[in-house]
């Protein structure tokens, strides 16, 4: 058993039918010694008396808010949550496996630049009685600070018969060094509590591996005289790290016909312009990627050829 | 070429070669991004590689003030990786494919380090840890980790030379 926060405790249980459970001793936070009784949740049934209460925690029915009273007055509370360990593996019932980029990916994170700011998100089908708390650091043995905000519900989707809820959180490294080569990964820890079930999820990454620039901005076409060719130009996204002579991007320019089956013409360039042939009913798209490190491409910025 | 005593390197040449290094490092092991090699307990293997750290002056401001600190750090790293790529880790079993970019990568590391440091001038270099994995699969894992680490190192070096070529070239 360990303390998650004040008056909230997590009991770690080997989880299988007929498991012996864990013996837990609760102590009433009071100088009083006599006349103390204990109850669980909203029930008025007295579970025991005395300054301490010893319980055998086996299932969710044994978890909940234990309260000690004296003469009708509440003295203190202890909320017991359960953390299930099935066959040596901690349960992951609360969050959905996003399976990208690999199985057992519950948290996904992205950064728009090298400033040390990043966003993580996760999915669940649970709509109520759900709380998240997020902590982060750079490195684990001698951790350096990363400050995370509160997790918020960022999207709701219908998937078949189920509703899916996306939560996200923004974090910022306290003393980020955008130009340095990271040697210690960022660690992100999410505590999830659903009713009386506790679970924790972690992710470990380098900012460089989660970079995904915003799409190029101000995408424009300039027809070239007496030619089917056009000059496409664009700019670095505002959110990208500066100076651009240091934090450089490379670009992919694509000409795509109306039909998905039509052959795509692609050009790669380090410049912020390119000359391409504009076909009727086609569209021109540009996306960006770090020039020197193969992290994710941005989403496409597009304009119609017409 | 860099000249001892603080004069500038051939920024444009260094830029071109460092960008080529980036391409080679990724073609040598493109899928490494999809393997979580940190799960494989690499503390004792790749923690000793020289990293370009915050105080090494490789940021735009640091380069403007005095690029020599940063260039020395990059040189140190290039020599370190050049030695690793020429070691038993890469030459032993399992053998690299004949068309593997590792050979080119090795040569380019050497080329860039020579651009930064002419003969007769010696910056101090970092000692290579003695890594001699016994099993072929351990060697393979170590190669992946070294290439992964090299990808990060050459990315920073390429940024430095690109910025230098754009803003510090005579």
């Amino acid at each position: 058993i360990w303390e998650l926060k004040k008056d909230v405790y997590v009991v770690e249980l080997d989880w299988y039918p007929d498991a012996p459970g864990e013996m837990v001793v609760l102590t009433c936070d009071t100088p009083e010694e006599d006349g103390i009784t204990w109850t669980l949740d909203q029930s008025s049934e007295v579970l025991g008396s005395g300054k301490t209460l010893t319980i055998q925690v086996k299932e969710f029915g044994d978890a909940g808010q234990y309260t000690c009273h004296k003469g009708g007055e509440v003295l203190s509370h202890s909320l017991l949550l359960l953390h299930k360990k099935e066959d040596g593996i901690w349960s992951t019932d609360i969050l959905k496996d996003q399976k990208e980029p690999k199985n057992k990916t519950f948290l996904r994170c992205e950064a728009k630049n090298y400033s040390g700011r990043f966003t993580c998100w996760w999915l669940t089908t649970i709509s109520t009685d759900l709380t998240f708390s997020v902590k982060s650091s750079r490195g684990s043995s001698d951790p350096q600070g990363v400050t995370c905000g509160a997790a918020t519900l960022s999207a709701e989707r219908v998937r078949g018969d189920n509703k899916e809820y996306e939560y996200s959180v923004e974090c910022q490294e306290d003393s980020a060094c955008p130009a340095a080569e990271e040697s210690l990964p960022i660690e992100v820890m999410v505590d999830a509590v659903h009713k009386l079930k506790y679970e924790n999820y972690t992710s470990s990454f380098f900012i460089r591996d989660i970079i995904k620039p915003d799409p190029p901005k101000n995408l424009q076409l300039k027809p070239l005289k007496n030619s089917r060719q056009v000059e496409v130009s664009w700019e670095y996204p505002d959110t990208w790290s500066t100076p651009h002579s240091y934090f450089s991007l490379t670009f992919c320019v694509q000409v795509q016909g109306k039909s998905k089956r039509e052959k795509k013409d692609r050009v790669f360039t380090d410049k912020t312009s390119a000359t391409v042939i504009c076909r009727k009913n086609a569209s021109i798209s540009v996306r960006a990627q770090d020039r020197y490190y193969s992290s994710s491409w941005s989403e496409w910025a597009s304009v119609p050829c017409s | 070429r860099a000249v001892p005593g603080g004069s500038s390197p051939a920024w444009t040449q260094c830029q071109q070669l460092s960008q080529k290094l980036c391409t080679l490092a990724w073609s040598a092991h493109p899928l490494v991004g999809h393997m979580d090699l940190r799960e494989e307990g690499d503390e004792e293997t790749t923690n000793d590689v020289p990293h370009i750290q915050c105080g090494d002056g490789c940021d735009p401001q640091g380069l403007r003030d005095n690029s020599q600190f940063c260039l020395q750090r990059i040189h140190q790293g290039l020599i370190f990786y050049e030695k690793l790529l020429g070691s038993d880790i890469f030459t032993g079993e399992p053998s690299l494919l004949p068309d593997s970019p590792v050979g080119q990568l090795h040569a380019s590391l050497l080329g860039l380090s020579q651009l930064l440091q002419p003969e007769g001038h010696h910056w101090e270099t970092q000692q290579i840890p003695s890594l001699s994995p016994s099993q072929p699969w351990q060697r393979l894992l170590l190669r992946f980790k070294i290439l992964r680490s090299l990808q990060a190192f050459v990315a920073v070096a390429a940024r430095v030379f690109a910025h230098g070529a754009a803003t510090l070239s005579p």
Partner: antibody, heavy 116, light 107 residues
Amino acid sequence: EVQLLESGGGLVQPGGSLRLSCAASGFTFSNYSMSWVRQAPGKGLEWVSSIRSSGGRTDYADSVKGRFTISRDNSKNTLYLQMNSLRAEDTAVYYCATGIAVARYWGQGTLVTVSS
Amino acid sequence: DIQMTQSPGTLSLSPGERATLSCRASQSVSSYLAWYQQKPGQAPRLLIYGASNRATGIPARFSGSGSGTDFTLTISSLEPEDFAVYFCQQYASPPRTFGQGTKLEMK
């Protein structure tokens, strides 16, 4: 005492369907993950499928993916295995068991024979 | 998929003797390994999980050891009721895979 009782096995033609049930008692069924494991006559054991306590997450062996569906009704304390497009190689004794990884408690099994 | 290989295929011993059964994984499964006993016409019974933890109600003569790729089930002194087929199973990564079994028969 934990008890698991399978039913629904029998003889079925190739391409046919069958639904196996497993009635659980002696424990709080809705709290625990469950699995199906099968054993071809005179052969070894093969994990078939598993389902989490809430029914929200399921896993299948490649050999049955797309043909078998595991489900549960926590109000009835029952685990199910819907088997479609049955093949001769699906002939086996099918056991239901508690757990997703380690099969701690087993039923006595029900025999499924796929033959024309 | 992770392949599990048990040896020997058959082991002939007498009551009172010590039995040593081996199980090898094609790649590391850490300590995520279980052993089961199966008697003719019966469902398997869990003996050991986590490579070395005895399941509820399993006699102390059964012990498991090993980690990574090589595992051993030891029965210190065979009782007549121990003659059965023994299976190992990894649960480090899906799909959970079983060994082909070792038949422990009376000499």
